[in-house]
């Protein structure tokens, strides 16, 4: 009748069949259930009997196969850090926490633990777009060709400059990164006074 | 031929410390989990301490954790136990003994005994 | 922590006779008991594990039985050299449990 075939089974080699869903147990030398996800061990296995697991408490979880014998406290996001909730802990999961908007993570320890605000892009300048938002700070890329922005943002993106005759309108000076086209009434002279402003 | 010499027991007092050793010969002692076992005059067996091949591991019965640990010199296939804050109650006869190392887990060798006195 | 309980204690017996000693578990322990003979002044020497099975060495008149939590040694006939002290231990969960030990003496 030895070994077994479902745990606990004896192991002379310290591994498991199973190691997601299994550990070995050296005080007895055998391989032992994990608990799952949501759970805990609330009675150690031995020999004669295979881990007990209890669900874990309210505000507190375990998310892989484990074999710990207490939950992990749930944690809220911490404001302080700049950080906000974008999922609430469950059994089996902790509290999912984002960087607030306009903010980037500074500090990383398997998640972050503190966002700071992102730097502020130049006018002729954008921020790079990321593949996930609030992974790092600003990097400020130039407008490209036909576009302009004319702020100190760290979210503000180049716009396409304005086509003065998809409105009936002349070109008075071109578009720059850091500014839009001026625009003019074909009909009417630019004053002076008046570079740098669309006429109607 | 397996076998297991204990020697180091004595008259201590009260509070006091003493280390026993256990002379492994006969067999790969690095494959074997190691125990202490100890016998009160004219009682039964108790369980005293265990450590796993490598020394690792070790553990031990309520009645003698934080007091009493167990180590192993492979090197040199000898068993330790050093026993601390001695009490009355620890006089006994201290045997090693080997656990099989299948999967029945008995004990299949024990060595001749070292008694250990505790008296004031 | 498991209780072993042994029976009896102590016990009279001739030579040629058969003897039973009993040790009952405080719940199954799934075969994980070792029976062990113990002479005055010497190591308890094993001889049945896994409540069935004869050790190496040992005499054939020396038997093993049981399941759960109810296991028996048997010696089917007495011998001058098996007067002695006898254990039960369980191994199937920690803090492993010796019986109180039973103590055959010649009738």
């Known amino acids: 009748s030895q070994p077994q075939a479902v745990p606990p089974y004896a192991s002379e080699n310290q591994t498991c069949r199973d190691q997601e869903k299994e550990y070995y147990e050296p005080q007895h030398r055998i391989c032992c259930s994990r608990c799952p996800p949501g759970t805990y061990v609330s009675a150690k296995c031995s020999r004669i009997r295979d881990t007990v697991c209890a669900t874990c408490a309210e505000n507190s979880y375990n998310e892989h196969w484990n074999y710990l014998t207490i939950c992990q406290l749930c944690r809220p996001c911490d404001p302080v850090m700049g950080l906000e909730e974008i999922a609430p802990c469950t059994s089996k999961r902790k509290t999912q926490c984002r960087c607030q908007p306009g903010m980037f993570c500074a500090a990383w320890a398997l998640e972050c633990t503190h966002c700071e605000l992102l730097s502020d892009c130049p006018p002729g300048t954008e921020a790079e777009l990321k593949d996930e938002v609030g992974k790092g700070n600003n990097h400020c890329v130039p407008c490209k060709a036909g576009h302009f922005q004319n702020t100190s943002s760290p979210s503000a993106r180049c716009q396409p400059h304005t086509r003065c005759e998809n409105q009936g309108l002349v070109e008075a000076a071109p578009g720059t990164a850091q500014s839009d086209t001026t625009c003019k009434n074909p009909l009417e002279p630019l004053p002076p006074e008046m570079s740098g402003t669309m006429l109607m | 031929e397996v076998q297991l010499v204990e020697s180091g027991g004595g008259l201590v007092k009260p509070g006091g410390s003493l280390r026993l050793s256990c002379a492994a010969s006969?067999?790969?002692?690095?494959?074997?989990?190691m125990y202490w076992v100890r016998q009160a005059p004219g009682k039964g067996l108790e369980w005293v301490a265990t450590?796993?091949?490598?020394?690792?591991?070790?553990y031990y019965p309520d009645s003698v954790k934080g007091r009493f640990t167990i180590s192993r010199d492979n090197a040199k296939n000898s068993l330790y136990l050093q026993m601390s804050s001695l009490r009355a109650e620890d006089t006994a006869v201290y045997y090693c003994?080997?656990?099989?190392?299948?999967?029945?887990?008995?004990?299949?060798?024990w060595g001749q005994g070292t008694t250990v006195t505790v008296s004031s | 922590d498991i209780q072993m309980t042994q029976s009896p204690s102590s016990l009279s017996a001739s030579v040629g006779d058969r003897v039973t000693i009993t040790c009952k578990a405080g719940?199954?322990?799934?075969?994980?008991l070792s029976w062990y003979q113990q002479k005055p002044g010497k190591a308890p020497k094993l001889l049945i594990y896994?409540?069935?099975r004869l050790a190496d060495g040992v005499p054939s008149r020396f038997s093993g039985s049981g399941s759960g939590t109810d296991y028996t040694l048997t010696i089917s006939s007495l011998q001058p050299e098996d007067f002695a002290t006898y254990y039960c231990?369980?191994?199937?969960?920690?803090?492993?449990?010796f019986g109180g030990g039973t103590k055959l003496e010649i009738k």
């Open positions: 719940q199954d322990i799934k075969s994980y």
């Open positions: 006969g067999f790969t002692f690095s494959d074997y989990y």
């Open positions: 896994y409540a069935t």
């Open positions: 003994a080997r656990e099989e190392n299948g999967n029945f887990y008995y004990f299949d060798y």
């Open positions: 231990l369980q191994h199937g969960e920690s803090p492993w449990t």
């Open positions: 450590i796993s091949d490598g020394g690792s591991y070790t």
